[in-house]
């Protein structure tokens, strides 16, 4: 088989026939050096999954539940292409599983016990697997058989396709539990009708069901959605209030050597030639000899899944939790109101060591998880492998786009009421050596630059955003002659100045000596012309305050700030000479962990925060000899956010807009993946 062949897996005679037709028609329109199709027939989707894992086939299209199976070891497959529905301008690749209730009913998600429930059908995604999976650990024991536990949880249900003889309560609201449209409460519309008629208190459906059944907004306003954080929202706010976000139909491939680019090339050309309304003789999204053969008949086209996206991220934390609960059936011993330990995400070895020290001192309240980059940490928090970390504003933006929420803000100024008063922010500045007297904001082209890291506020987003407005392109590596911007591509001139050895060169963590505020300033001291840092960086590393050999003899007076008007000022005049105000670093977590992270961190800072006077004899959370490990070293406390509890509100409209403008220059693979899930 030639290298450019994609071996498609078919699960029936009819699919194999369509696959052969697909192969033949592709041959007729694609040049001989282009991608081609071969067909492999297997007895089931699970056999297809195993065949792809064993390199006997390359691709198959799966529903969400099977994407989960495909991801599990030893299969280790990943999503590579998504079918979309709707229009090319507004492509829908996901649907949202929601819990709909009547507006005047006064209960929340955590008060569903004893209510009457309406389901689309037993074993169906939005109507059963997701809600019951998420409620699984609240079900009365024994939880097997599941139908019995569900029957004992709700006071009555309609779950079409259930066994009415063994589990009569599941058919109480729709006598007989018929498994077809003959049952008026079957399927999405049926489950909604069950709620509408007053038979049930809650209907588990998908987000579009309400719109399909109630054309009139006034009618829709009589209903609300139950959110997982025990609040309610209007039905049109399903993107912020759902049980899970579920991919509709997805092509999967091997994680390693999976031909994902070739599969995309093939399907992209296939949709050009044989997509919706393209060809009479062969149609990709049509199944004359059956239904949904190879692809869904209702699909309108394909979208490439961003390469950073593994199955866990693609399926989303809620969906994976629900399915894992149903499959594995494991729950904590007894659900308690006690918070579980917070799993803190630490970057590289230096942070991990400090985190471990914190963990030991916290007496079981903090556990540690390691990752190599900030983006890897954010991904781990998203999928539940970690719970929290403190982030620079630029990463708060990415984390927010990925569904995480800010929970506490670092405060840097001593005040009587530190924990109750989140600050306005710090200043992003451009520092130069006083001796380079001809250097100004207007003649930085061709100079050597030092950045905290790509994607960070003071070191990247603010200066590069301002620069982008001037030069109107993203080739910052051409603007500066060389520099160190950890997180840049290794062959970029913006890695040339970095000092990390071997694989650590230009890595966005403390293994790169020029990483972070102190690192960027060190880069200026030793090699660079300009450093983009925060206003406190120079005083914190001069006058003997940093004992490291490179810093111990430095003098603040030998450095100046570049002002945007082309002038220069002494370092202490940052308030009148800065690039912009930057939002303080903030702790982020998943929505479901928000309350516990808040509670435990407030306890921890009372034990190990700035009230500890002797850090040589005690563990200090906000100290790490100018290395800013886990938190900035100048943190005085972690402050409540009050109502600034979303990333947009926390960062502020101006900063969100600035980072949004710079998005076209973004090299963040995680941001690309997260905006795929939520454009």
């Amino acid at each position: 088989v030639p290298d450019k062949t994609v071996r498609w897996c078919a699960v029936s005679e009819h699919e194999a026939t369509k696959c052969q037709s697909f192969r033949d028609h592709m041959k007729s329109v694609i040049p001989s050096d282009g991608p081609s199709v071969a067909c492999v027939k297997k007895a089931s989707y699970l056999d297809c999954i195993r065949a792809i894992a064993a390199n006997e086939a390359d691709a198959v299209t799966l529903d969400a539940g099977l994407v989960y199976d495909a991801y599990l070891a030893p299969n280790n497959l990943k999503p590579v292409v998504a079918e979309f529905y709707g229009s090319k301008e507004d492509p829908q690749t996901f649907y949202y599983a929601v819990a709909v209730v009547k507006k005047d009913s006064g209960f929340q998600m955590n008060q569903l016990r004893g209510k009457k429930s309406c389901h689309t059908g037993l074993g169906r995604s939005a109507g059963w697997n997701i809600p019951i999976g998420l409620l699984y650990c609240d079900l009365p024991e024994p939880r097997k058989p599941l139908e019995k536990a569900v029957a004992n949880f709700f006071s009555g249900s309609c779950a079409p396709c259930a066994d009415g003889t063994d589990f009569p309560q599941l058919c109480q609201l729709c006598p007989g539990c018929g498994c077809s449209t003959l049952n008026q409460y079957f399927g999405y519309s049926g489950a909604f009708k069950c709620l509408k008629d007053g038979a049930g208190d809650v209907a588990f459906v998908k987000h579009s069901t309400i719109f399909e059944n109630l054309a009139n907004k006034a009618d829709r306003d009589q209903y609300e959605l139950l959110c997982l954080d025990n609040t309610r929202k209007p039905v049109d706010e399903y993107k912020d209030c759902h049980l899970a976000q579920v991919p509709s139909h997805t092509v999967v491939a091997r994680s390693m050597g999976g031909k994902e680019d070739l599969i995309w090339e093939l399907l992209n050309q296939a949709q050009e030639h044989f997509g919706k309304d393209k060809s009479k003789e062969f149609q990709l999204f049509s199944s004359p000899h059956g239904k949904d053969l190879l692809f869904k008949d209702s699909a309108h086209g394909f979208l490439k899944v961003p390469p950073r996206m593994d199955a866990k991220m693609y399926l989303g934390y809620e969906y994976v939790t629900a399915i894992r609960n149903l499959r594995e059936g494991t729950c904590p011993e007894a659900p308690t109101d006690e918070c579980k330990p917070v799993k803190w995400c630490a970057l590289s070895h230096h942070e991990r060591l400090k985190c471990d020290e914190w963990s030991v001192n916290s007496v079981g309240k903090i556990e540690c998880v390691s990752a190599e980059t900030t983006e890897d940490c954010i991904a781990k928090i998203m999928n539940g492998e970690a719970d929290a970390m403190s982030l620079d504003g630029g990463f708060v933006y990415i984390a927010g786009k990925c569904g995480l929420v800010p929970v506490l803000a670092e405060n840097y100024n001593k005040s009587d009421n530190c924990e109750d008063t989140p600050e306005a922010g710090y200043f992003a500045i451009a520092v130069v050596k006083k001796s380079a007297s001809d250097l100004t904001w207007d003649n930085l082209k061709g100079k050597k630059s030092c950045h905290t890291a790509v994607g960070r506020t003071a070191g990247w987003n603010i200066p590069m955003g301002l620069l982008y407005n001037k030069i109107n392109h993203c080739r910052f590596d051409e603007f500066f002659s060389e520099g160190c911007a950890p997180g840049s591509k290794k062959d970029s001139s913006l890695c040339k100045l970095c000092m990390g050895s071997g694989l650590n060169l230009c890595e966005p963590n403390n293994k790169e000596g020029y990483y972070g505020y102190t690192g960027a300033f060190r880069c200026l001291v030793e090699k660079g012309d300009v450093a983009f840092v925060k206003h406190q960086t120079v005083p914190q590393n001069t006058g003997g305050k940093n004992p490291d050999p490179w810093a111990k003899n430095l003098n603040e007076k030998d450095y100046e700030l570049l002002c945007l008007d082309g002038t220069r000022k002494p370092v202490e005049e940052y308030a009148n000479c800065h690039l912009a105000r930057a939002p303080n670093h903030a702790v982020v977590t998943r929505k479901d962990k928000e309350a516990c992270v808040h509670k435990i961190l407030r306890q921890q800072q009372h034990l190990f925060g700035s009230n500890v006077t002797d850090c040589s004899g005690n563990f200090c959370l906000f100290r790490s000899e100018t290395k800013d490990l886990l938190f900035r070293d100048d943190t005085v406390c972690l402050a409540k956010l009050h109502d600034r509890n979303t990333y947009e509100k926390y960062l502020g409209e101006e900063y969100v807009k600035a980072v949004g403008n710079l998005r076209k220059c973004s090299t963040s693979s995680l941001l690309e993946a997260c905006t795929f899930r939520r454009p």
Partner: nanobody
């Protein structure tokens, strides 16, 4: 009340080995983990190695591969085996567990 006593320090030539012990009086020692610190003259106290109750260990970069921390819960003891010692390893070594004050420490001197 739990007290910690560190022993095993001494004068050793570069390249040599020492085995430090940290013995606790009283029960519940090290239930949340034990940390070895060191302090060189005129320098900040720094973490050298730690061991948690589940046996997980971690070390500062400069001692990785040379030092090994281990525990014997039956004897209420945590050990620090130090091999290939370097002059930079010189200092007073202390062990610590949450809620228990620092002991006197044990002096380690590595001559070149």
């Amino acid at each position: 009340e739990v007290q910690l006593v560190e022993c095993g320090g001494g004068l050793v030539q570069a390249g040599g080995s020492l085995r430090l012990s940290c013995v606790a009086s009283g029960s519940g020692f090290g239930i949340n983990g034990v940390i070895w610190y060191r302090q060189a003259p005129g320098k900040q106290r720094e973490l050298v190695a730690l061991i948690k109750s589940d046996g997980y260990t971690n070390y500062r970069e400069s001692v990785k591969g040379r030092f090994t921390i281990s525990r014997d819960d039956a004897r209420n003891t945590v050990w620090l085996q130090m091999n290939a010692l370097e002059p930079e390893d010189t200092g007073v070594y202390y062990c610590k567990t949450p809620g228990v004050p620092f002991g006197q420490g044990t002096q380690v001197t590595v001559s070149s």
